[in-house]
Interface confidence: medium
C-alpha cells in the first residue's frame, strides 16, 4: 500500500504558497457546469474529471489541481490527483468528496466537471462451443487489400496475443487503466480476462476469420476481466494514442472502441479532438435496444457508430435487449454469431454477438479502404462506408416506430473496388436531435467540418412546424427547423456532401404576399441550385397552392408559399451540374417519393406546397421522401395534392478537383 504522507506535505506547502483569495470566481463570469451519468448504477461518485477551458496550458492545469487540493485541505478534506490531462483535453482526474464540487466549479479555467462512470464491453458469448477448425477457410475470402498500411488501436480487455489468429499482428502496449473487478467471489482467469479483446482482434485482422487480414493492431487495456471500464480510463487511453501519434507519426490510424457507457460530455469531447487530429474512430452503438444517442462514445458525431444485424439483415436481439438504433447510428454491420478467436486456447474459435463485433467489422473495412487510399479524410471515409453499404435491407419493424425514420437502413459492405470512386458526388443525411414541444423550439442539424451543407429540410410528426432555413453559425452553414404552436416538436434534416473547392451561399426571398407565391433563384454566374428550404412565421400556411411546376428553362429556382420566405442553396464547384426532378400526386397520399437516376446524387429534397398537412421532407439515400398527414384526416380535396421535389447533382470533375487540392 502506498505511503500518502507526500499528499499531506504537498497540501501543507500549497496552503502556505497560495494567497488567501483562493476561491475566485471563474473568468468572464461564466459558470462551470457539473455532469453525471444519467444511469445511476453506472455512476462512480468520488472520482471526477475536471475539464479546463480549451486554451489552458499544462502548467495551469497543474496549478488549478494544486489550488483545489489546498482549498480542500483547509476544509479538512483529503484529495488525490490521479492524472493530469494534456494532449487531447486540458484538465485533471481527481479523487475527492462530492462535497467539494461547488468549490471545484468556482476554480479558474474550469469549463465543466464530470463524475466518472462505467463503460462496458458490448458483446455476448452467444454459444460457447469451440469451433475447430474455423468455419471459414483462408482461401474463401481474399480481400483486394488487407489493410497493411493502417494501424488499428483496440481499447478493450487484455488479449491473448499468441493466439494463432492474431499472433504477430497485435502489439500489446503497456497501457492499462482498469477498475477493480466487482464482487467478493470473482476470480481472475486469464482466458476469461482476454475473451472479449481476443475475439475482436480476430474479427478485425485474424488470419482465417478476419476482415482486414493485413492490418496491424495495438491493444490498450481499458476493460477489466468482467468487461468493465471507466470513462476516465478510456480518456487516458485516448490521450495515450494521441501522444503516441505525436511522438511517432505513422500512416492512417483507426481506433476501435467496442464499449459503451451512459452519455458522457467529456468522452464525446475527447473523441472529437482525436477525430480532428485525423484519427478514424469506430465504436459500438450499444446493446441496450435503445436510442444510441443516450450512450457514449456512440453519441459523438465524429465517431463512426455501428449497430448490429444478423445474417437475415434483421437487427440483432441480445437476450431481452439488442442493438441500439436511432440518428446517432451511422450504419449497421454483422453482429450475430460472429466466429472469431477464442482465448480458451491458441487455436480455439468461438462465436460472439453484439455491436462490438459489428464495430470490429467496420474497423476492418475502414482499414482496407484507408490502406487503398491513405489520404482519405474521416468525412470521405464515412461517406464511402455509407455509399457502399447495402441499402434498405433491414426490417425496420424491429425498431420503435418513432425511431424508424431516424435510423439508417444501411449494412456495411466492402467496396467492389477500392479505387475509382473519386468522381462520385457523395452525400449523406444528418438528422438533428428533436427540438422539444415549446412554441419557439428549434432543432439544428450540422455537417462535419469538411462537408458542405447542400440542402435543409424539416419534419414533424404532428405536422405543426414553421419550416426550416439555412443559416451561418461559426463560419459554417447549419440547418435549423422551427416548431409551431401546439406542435410536438420538429427535426432538422441536413444533406451533407463532399464537394471539394465548393463555394456555396444561401439566397433568400421574403414572403411575396402575391398570389403567385414566393420564388428565389441562383443568380450568380456558374452557381447551380442544390437545395430549397422554406420558413414561415404564421402558425398555419393555409391551403394556398403555388404553381407546382416551374416555368420551363428556370431550373435554378425555388418556389414556395406566398406567406413563406424561401431559401435557395446555390453552389459553384468544378464540373457540378444539377437538375430538378418532381413527382406530384393529385390525390392525397401519405408518402410521395422521387429518386435520382443512376450516376446522379440527391442533394435537395423538399415538398410543394408547404401547407400544414405536409409533415415534412427528408432524403433516404438517393430518394426524396415527402410525408403527409393520414389521408383520412385530409380528405380527397385538392389540398391533399403533394409534390416531392428532388434536386439531383453530379460532378464528373471531382477526381480532378481533389487532385488539384493536393
Amino acid at each position: 500500500q502506498e505511503d500518502e504522507d507526500g499528499d499531506y506535505e504537498e497540501l501543507v506547502l500549497a496552503l502556505r504558497s497560495e494567497e488567501d483569495g483562493l476561491a475566485e470566481a471563474p473568468e468572464h463570469g461564466t459558470t462551470a457546469t457539473f455532469h453525471r451519468c444519467a444511469k445511476d448504477p453506472w455512476r462512480l461518485p468520488g472520482t471526477y474529471v475536471v475539464v479546463l477551458k480549451e486554451e489552458t496550458h499544462l502548467s495551469q492545469s497543474e496549478r488549478t489541481a494544486r489550488r483545489l487540493q489546498a482549498q480542500a485541505a483547509r476544509r479538512g478534506y483529503l484529495t488525490k490527483i490521479l492524472h493530469v490531462f494534456h494532449g487531447l483535453l486540458p484538465g485533471f482526474l481527481v479523487k475527492m468528496s462530492g462535497d467539494l464540487l461547488e468549490l471545484a466549479l468556482k476554480l479558474p479555467h474550469v469549463d465543466y466537471i464530470e463524475e466518472d462512470s462505467s463503460v462496458f464491453a458490448q458483446s455476448i458469448p452467444w454459444n460457447l462451443e469451440r469451433i475447430t477448425p474455423p468455419r471459414y477457410r483462408a482461401d474463401e475470402y481474399q480481400p483486394p487489400d488487407g489493410g497493411s498500411l493502417v494501424e488499428v488501436y483496440l481499447l478493450d480487455t487484455s488479449i491473448q496475443s499468441d493466439h494463432r489468429e492474431i499472433e504477430g499482428r497485435v502489439m500489446v502496449t503497456d497501457f492499462e487503466n482498469v477498475p477493480e473487478e466487482d464482487g467478493t467471489r470473482f476470480h481472475r482467469q486469464a482466458s476469461k480476462c482476454d475473451s472479449h479483446g481476443t475475439h475482436l482482434a480476430g474479427v478485425v485482422s485474424g488470419r482465417d476469420a478476419g476482415v482486414a487480414k493485413g492490418a496491424s493492431m495495438r491493444s490498450l487495456r481499458v476493460l477489466n476481466c468482467q468487461g468493465k471500464g471507466t470513462v476516465s480510463g478510456t480518456l487516458i487511453g485516448l490521450e495515450f494514442i494521441r501522444k503516441s501519434q505525436l511522438v511517432q507519426p505513422v500512416g492512417p490510424l483507426v481506433v476501435l472502441l467496442p464499449l459503451a457507457g451512459g452519455y458522457s460530455r467529456v468522452l464525446n469531447a475527447a473523441c472529437q479532438r482525436l477525430a480532428r487530429a485525423g484519427v478514424v474512430l469506430v465504436t459500438a452503438a450499444g446493446n441496450f435496444r435503445d436510442d444510441a444517442c443516450l450512450y457514449s462514445p456512440a453519441s459523438a458525431p465524429e465517431v463512426i457508430t455501428v449497430g448490429a444485424t444478423n445474417a437475415q439483415d434483421q437487427p440483432v436481439t441480445l437476450g431481452t435487449l439488442g442493438t441500439n438504433f436511432g440518428r446517432c447510428v451511422d450504419l449497421f454491420a454483422p453482429g450475430e454469431d460472429i466466429i472469431g478467436a477464442s482465448s480458451d486456447c491458441s487455436t480455439c474459435f468461438v462465436s460472439q454477438s453484439g455491436t462490438s463485433q459489428a464495430a470490429a467489422h467496420v474497423a476492418g473495412i475502414a482499414a482496407m479502404m484507408l490502406s487503398a487510399e491513405p489520404e482519405l479524410t474521416l468525412a470521405e471515409l464515412r461517406q464511402r462506408l455509407i455509399h457502399f453499404s447495402a441499402k434498405d435491407v433491414i426490417n425496420e419493424a424491429w425498431f420503435p416506430e418513432d425511431q424508424r425514420v431516424l435510423t439508417p437502413n444501411l449494412v456495411a459492405a466492402l467496396p467492389p473496388s477500392t479505387h475509382g470512386a473519386g468522381w462520385q458526388l457523395f452525400c449523406r443525411t444528418v438528422w438533428s436531435a428533436h427540438s422539444g414541444p415549446t412554441r419557439m423550439a428549434t432543432a439544428v442539424a450540422r455537417c462535419a467540418p469538411d462537408e458542405e451543407l447542400l440542402s435543409c429540410s424539416s419534419f414533424s410528426r404532428s405536422g405543426k412546424r414553421r419550416g426550416e432555413r439555412m443559416e451561418a453559425q461559426g463560419g459554417k452553414l447549419v440547418c435549423r427547423a422551427h416548431n409551431a404552436f401546439g406542435g410536438e416538436g420538429v427535426y432538422a434534416i441536413a444533406r451533407c456532401c463532399l464537394l471539394p473547392q465548393a463555394n456555396c451561399s444561401v439566397h433568400t426571398a421574403p414572403p411575396a404576399e402575391a398570389s403567385m407565391g414566393t420564388r428565389v433563384h441562383c443568380h450568380q454566374q456558374g452557381h447551380v441550385l442544390t437545395g430549397c428550404s422554406s420558413h414561415w412565421e404564421v402558425e398555419d400556411l393555409g391551403t394556398h397552392k403555388p404553381p407546382v411546376l416551374r416555368p420551363r428553362g428556370q431550373p435554378n429556382q425555388c418556389v414556395g408559399h406566398r406567406e413563406a420566405s424561401i431559401h435557395a442553396s446555390c453552389c459553384h464547384a468544378p464540373g457540378l451540374e444539377c437538375k430538378v426532378k418532381e413527382h406530384g400526386i393529385p390525390a392525397p397520399q401519405e408518402q410521395v417519393t422521387v429518386a435520382c437516376e443512376e450516376g446522379w446524387t440527391l442533394t435537395g429534397c423538399s415538398a410543394l406546397p408547404g401547407t400544414s398537412h405536409v409533415l415534412g421532407a427528408y432524403a433516404v439515400d438517393n430518394t426524396c421522401v415527402v410525408r403527409s398527414r393520414d389521408v383520412s384526416t385530409t380528405g380527397s380535396t385538392s389540398e391533399g395534392a403533394v409534390t416531392a421535389v428532388a434536386i439531383c447533382c453530379r460532378s464528373r470533375h471531382l477526381a480532378q478537383a481533389s487532385q488539384e487540392l493536393q
Epitope: Q1, E4, D5, Y8, P45, G46, R75, G76, Y77, L78, T79, K80, K95, M96, S97, G98, D99, P179, E180, D182
Partner: nanobody, 126 residues
Framework: QVKLEESGGGLVQAGGSLRLSCAAS????????LGWFRQAPGKLPEFVAA????????YYADSVKGRDTISKDHTKNAVDLQMNSLKPEDSATYYC???????????????????WGQGTQVTVSS
Amino acid sequence: QVKLEESGGGLVQAGGSLRLSCAASGRTPRHYILGWFRQAPGKLPEFVAAVREPGSSTYYADSVKGRDTISKDHTKNAVDLQMNSLKPEDSATYYCAVDPYPTPEFTTHVGHYDYWGQGTQVTVSS
C-alpha cells in the same frame, strides 16, 4: 499516514456477543468513511458495516443488519462494532479500513478503502 488498529476479537459461542474496536491515529482527514470488513480463509474480504464522519450516519451489509451496530467512540477516537447473535459463519478475520474520499453514497467495495488495519480474529464455535 493514517494508522488503524483493531482489538476485541476472540473465541465466542454461537448466539454470543463481541465488541470490536478500531483505533485511528496519525493524520486522519476530517471527512472520511470507516468501514469494517471480514475475510474468511480462502475468501475475499466482505463488507460488514461503515460509519461516516462527521455526522455518524451508518450503513450495514444485509447479512448483519439488525445484529451488528457500528458507532463512534469520540473519547477514544475509535469506532466500535458491536456484534450480537453471532453464528459460526461469522467466523473470520475482521479488518477496519478508511475511505478518505467519502462520496454521498456509502461504498462497500474494498478498492475504495485506502488504509487498513492488521485485523483481529473472531471465531464462533457451535
